[in-house]
């Protein structure tokens, strides 16, 4: 069974005092995010018993093995359900605790129960305080039973449950009508899958007499102690104040276990600890009796003395649970309660036995599960023990169960039981993960769920090339981490498998499913150089670059020209996909910007060592355009433009530019500065005569701005050819020659 | 579905007695409270008698107490009504009923069986 | 055990809305919220319509709702239809185990 503990503090003059704890003994419990161990859970089971709404309960972790939850308000908040969850995979297990408030109505004489398939069980509610009503009984929050309030029996209401069966499990109320419910007796019904005595999937197995009140689990034929016992028939008793089903955990507080209430996996249910007593578990035993609830009795022989906590403590000569085995009948000596083999091993197992006449080899034999007796191969003898050891042959999983040393002498006879756990050694369900990758090395994620036994105590990833006869290389890792594979060959496939062990000879598992992982191509390792830049607008800028030569074939698919515009902290990425590219342009830059400019070379993924930085300013853009262009002719070799002038400025304009050009000709435009920028008129001469020319025109400021629409119009008559146009402006307002 | 079927009515002499018998089906007889309902000619409903699921528990309207006795065999499903010294007052329909669980109402009742006492 | 007490009759016209009150004592709706209320159609068996004073099983109209003050438990309809004129019982369980009805109420839809 899982090693969970729920442990309520019962001291409940103040409900803001009360605590759960959830204890887990299993190794790597709770640890959450690790891929061994989902974490603890405990909360409030609101589906059967609600309780009023108050402040959120409080969840506090202690390390990995415990959680606790506090924060409790006012004693109805404590009133319910309460479970804790631990345990991982198919071991992963509830535990419930039912709280019953101490003024209730009714109250439960035992609040667990734990019976066998087809037994009667008898549910009793006393009476606390009376009202003259109907008893309502629930099971899971479902009406039940009713009861009159006249069939009570000695200020008890019973409800018998003859013939019960494991779905009968559950929680059960008995209320009065028209009472609160959390006036209720509160109980936990919890139904062996077997009979008694018997465990297994059609209760064949033979359970292995459980004691000090040790309850056999229906599934795994093993006991759940009570709290204060451990062992594998819970036949040895810890120190008082310690439990856990190695007595690891230790109470807290100086009255050690007194005033808490111990829940544990079904089929045990809760109970007081070891040598406590009483609804708040807060008597101690009475004397002659011991255990949890103190449910047991000593009845100790030979002069034995009782303690509460241990039962039967045994003067010199003698022992056994009632001190009634005199020390010269032969007693196995020191047999571990529990062994734990990997399947198809050969174990050696070895007995010691003691007693007067002296055990010798043939003495003392090993029995299997299933019947079989194995006589030892040799014996050690001391002077005060006989050592037998035993050859086991190669372990099925049918070996699994309780297997039996027994010893016999002429002065009587001992026997042992103790549990044999066969383990399936742990077989990857799924291939190891590839995280990244390099030219020569693979980064590889090795956690993968598995079929068989844990805990896992080795990885092992094996890989070679893909299709290669070679051997496998290997590499042994740490369970939880990832794995770096080195010195590979670039752009290659490597076939990876992951194997996994579990502790012990012989638990390594078969080799998972291969998967085909491939390191990067080579990482490019030259470094070009930029060679020079100019602008060509306030947003493009013309980049190039150079490599240096060197023999063979260029490493590198493309370039990668990165901008950094430190001002805004944005970077600009343009990929060149031609390794025979020296010169790039880029556009849509940002006008009047300060960039730092560098290239690298690109090889699949990888990056190339970048240029040497250089710094580029752009500048900045230009005036909105001017409005309203008009053209007019003059004569056949003048014509006069005039506007008006930009709106918006961001500051005051250096000159205009106009361009001007043939309508329909194939030349370059010409383009005429016009230097004076108060100036809203000009007058282009030099035009030849009857042809047709575009205008355009735009401000300067910093940088030039934007161009304003386009105007047509033609010269007049048919004069001679002119040298070419030139300007002349004026204030057209005031109409003077300038 | 919830059934209960009432049978034993009949014609009987003042004094006399009679049976009723009441069959249910469509839950679970064992664990319900069950009533005895009974309604005169042209006259209001008149709660009779109400038996307990243990049986252990019995209780009567005072005009027939000493006279009548509620009884069930939860191994049959049914719940039964021994009426004896009938008088010309019992003369009425008969409902079987059934109680709802955890409740105080009678939430299913039967078609009802009529009883007449007469010379 | 004695009957509780309605009015012997009420009418109303279609549409309207119509109450049927019921007065017990302390022992019985004074004592309990387990007032129920009942209608029956001539030569047929009782059907509940209200329950622990206020609830309506499923199935029936939310024209029908059921209220107590103090001793006194109330049934109204609302939107009266022809197929509301039947006779109404309250009912009552009391602090002996046992149950008490009202003596009905015959309603009449106008």
């Known amino acids: 069974a899982v090693d969970l503990t729920l442990l309520a503090n019962l001291r409940l003059t103040d409900p803001q005092r009360f605590f759960l704890t959830c204890v887990s003994g299993e190794a790597g419990a709770g640890r959450g995010s690790d891929a061994w161990g989902p974490p603890l859970l405990l909360e409030k089971d609101d589906r059967i018993v609600r309780t009023p709404p108050g402040p959120p309960l409080r969840l506090a972790r202690n390390g990995s093995h415990q959680v606790t939850l506090r924060g409790f308000s006012k004693p109805s908040d404590l009133v319910g359900v309460f479970s804790c969850v631990g345990g991982a995979g198919a071991r992963r297990t509830r535990v419930i605790y039912v709280h019953n408030s101490p003024g209730a109505h009714l109250l439960p004489d035992k609040v667990t129960h734990t019976v066998n398939k087809g037994d009667t069980a008898v549910l009793s509610a006393r009476v606390h305080k009376e009202k003259q009503t109907d008893v309502i009984w629930k099971s899971n929050g479902s009406y039940f039973y009713t009861l009159d309030w006249h069939e009570a029996q000695d200020g008890r209401f019973l409800l018998q449950l003859p013939n019960v069966q494991p779905p009968s499990s559950g929680i059960y109320s008995a209320t009065y009508l028209e009472a609160s419910p959390l006036g209720s007796a509160f109980f936990r019904l919890i139904v062996r899958g077997c009979g008694a005595g018997r465990w297994g999937p059609g209760c064949t197995k033979e359970c292995p007499g459980c004691l000090h009140g040790g309850v056999c689990h229906d599934h795994d034929g093993e006991c759940v102690c009570p709290p204060g016992f451990t062992g594998t028939r819970c036949e040895q008793a810890c120190r008082e104040g310690r439990f856990g089903q190695s007595c690891q955990e230790q109470c807290p507080g100086i009255s050690g276990c007194r005033g808490l209430t111990f829940c544990l996996p079904d089929p045990y249910g809760c109970s007081c600890g070891s040598g406590w007593r009483g609804s708040q578990c807060q008597e101690a035993c009475a004397p002659g009796h011991f255990g949890a609830d103190c449910r047991l009795q000593c009845q100790c022989q030979n002069g034995g003395t009782c303690d509460r906590f241990s039962g039967c403590v045994c003067p010199s000569g003698w022992h056994g649970v009632h001190c009634e085995k005199s020390d010269r009948i032969p007693q196995i000596l020191n047999m571990a309660s529990e062994l734990e083999f990997n399947l198809e091993t050969m174990p050696r197992i070895n007995c010691a036995a003691a007693g007067n006449p002296f055990p010798v080899r043939g003495s003392i034999e090993l029995r299997k599960p299933d019947g079989t007796v194995l006589l030892s191969t040799k014996a050690i003898v001391e002077p005060e023990k006989t050592t037998a050891e035993f050859e086991v042959p190669r372990l099925v999983l049918a070996d699994s169960g309780f297997w039996e040393c027994r010893v016999s002498t002429s002065g009587g006879q001992d026997s042992r039981r103790f549990k044999v756990n066969v383990k399936v050694p742990p077989v990857p369900l799924a291939a190891p993960r590839l995280l990244t990758k390099q030219s020569r090395q693979l980064v590889v994620s090795p956690l993968v769920s598995f079929s068989g036994d844990g805990p896992i105590s080795t990885v092992r990833l094996h890989y070679r090339p893909q299709d290669s006869t070679m051997d496998w290389s290997t590499i042994v890792v740490d369970p939880s981490e990832n794995v770096t594979l080195m010195n590979l060959r670039p752009k290659t496939g490597y076939s990876v498998r992951v194997q996994l062990s579990r502790p012990g000879e012989g638990g390594e598992g078969a080799w998972g499913p291969p998967t085909l992982m491939t390191t990067d191509c080579p990482e490019p390792l030259l470094q070009p150089w930029l060679e020079g830049w100019h602008v060509e607008g306030t947003d493009r800028l013309r980049v190039s670059w150079s490599l240096p030569l060197v023999p063979g074939p260029l490493v590198g698919d493309g370039f990668l020209l990165r901008l950094w515009d430190g001002t805004r902290g944005q970077e600009r990425r343009e990929n060149v996909s031609s390794p025979q590219a020296r010169t790039a342009l880029l556009t849509g830059l940002t006008p009047g910007t300060h960039y730092q400019l560098d290239v690298q070379l690109y090889h699949c993924t990888l990056l190339g060592p970048a240029s040497p930085p250089a710094h580029v300013l752009l500048p900045p853009s230009g005036p909105p355009a001017p409005r309203h262009l008009h053209a007019q002719a003059l004569s056949d070799s003048e014509i006069q433009l005039t506007w008006k002038h930009p709106e918006a400025l961001p500051g005051p304009i250096s000159k205009y530019v106009v361009e001007v050009q043939v309508a329909g000709g194939a030349g370059d435009p010409l383009w005429i500065d016009v230097d004076r920028p108060e100036e809203t008129s000009t007058i282009i001469r030099g035009l030849n005569a009857s042809t047709r020319y575009l205008f355009r025109m735009r401000a300067s400021i910093q940088g030039l701005g934007d161009w304003s629409n386009t105007v047509e119009e033609s010269t007049l008559g048919n004069g001679l050819q002119a040298e070419g146009p030139v300007q002349e402006s004026r204030a057209a307002e005031e109409g003077l020659d300038q | 579905e919830v059934q209960l079927l009432e049978s034993g009515g009949g014609l009987v002499q003042p004094g006399g007695s009679l049976r009723l018998s009441c069959a249910a089906s469509?839950?679970?007889?064992?664990?319900?409270?069950m009533s005895w309902v009974r309604q005169a000619p042209g006259k209001g409903l008149e709660w009779v008698s109400s038996i307990y699921p243990s049986g252990g528990g019995t209780y009567y309207a005072d005009s027939v107490k000493g006279r009548f006795t509620i009884s069930r065999d939860n191994s049959k499903n049914t719940l039964y009504l021994q009426m004896n010294s009938l008088r010309a007052e019992d003369t009425a329909t008969y409902y079987c009923?059934?109680?709802?669980?955890?409740?105080?109402?009678?939430?299913?009742w039967g078609q009802g069986t009529l009883v007449t006492v007469s010379s | 055990q004695s009957a509780l007490t309605q009015p012997a009759s009420v009418s109303g016209s279609p549409g309207q809305s119509i109450t049927i009150s019921c007065t017990g004592t302390s022992s019985d709706i004074g004592a309990y919220k387990h007032v129920s209320w009942y209608q029956q159609h001539p030569g047929k068996a009782p059907k509940l319509m209200i329950y622990e004073v206020t609830n309506r099983p499923s199935g029936i109209s939310n024209r029908f709702s059921g209220s107590k003050s103090g001793n006194t438990a109330s049934l109204t309809i609302s939107g009266l239809q022809a197929e509301d004129e039947a006779d109404y019982y309250c009912?009552?369980?009391?602090?002996?185990?046992?149950?008490?009805f009202g003596g009905g109420t015959k309603l009449t839809v106008l």
């Open positions: 009912s009552s369980y009391t602090s002996r185990n046992t149950w008490v």
């Open positions: 009923a059934r109680r709802k669980a955890a409740a105080g109402y009678l939430d299913y």
């Open positions: 469509g839950f679970t007889f064992s664990v319900y409270v």
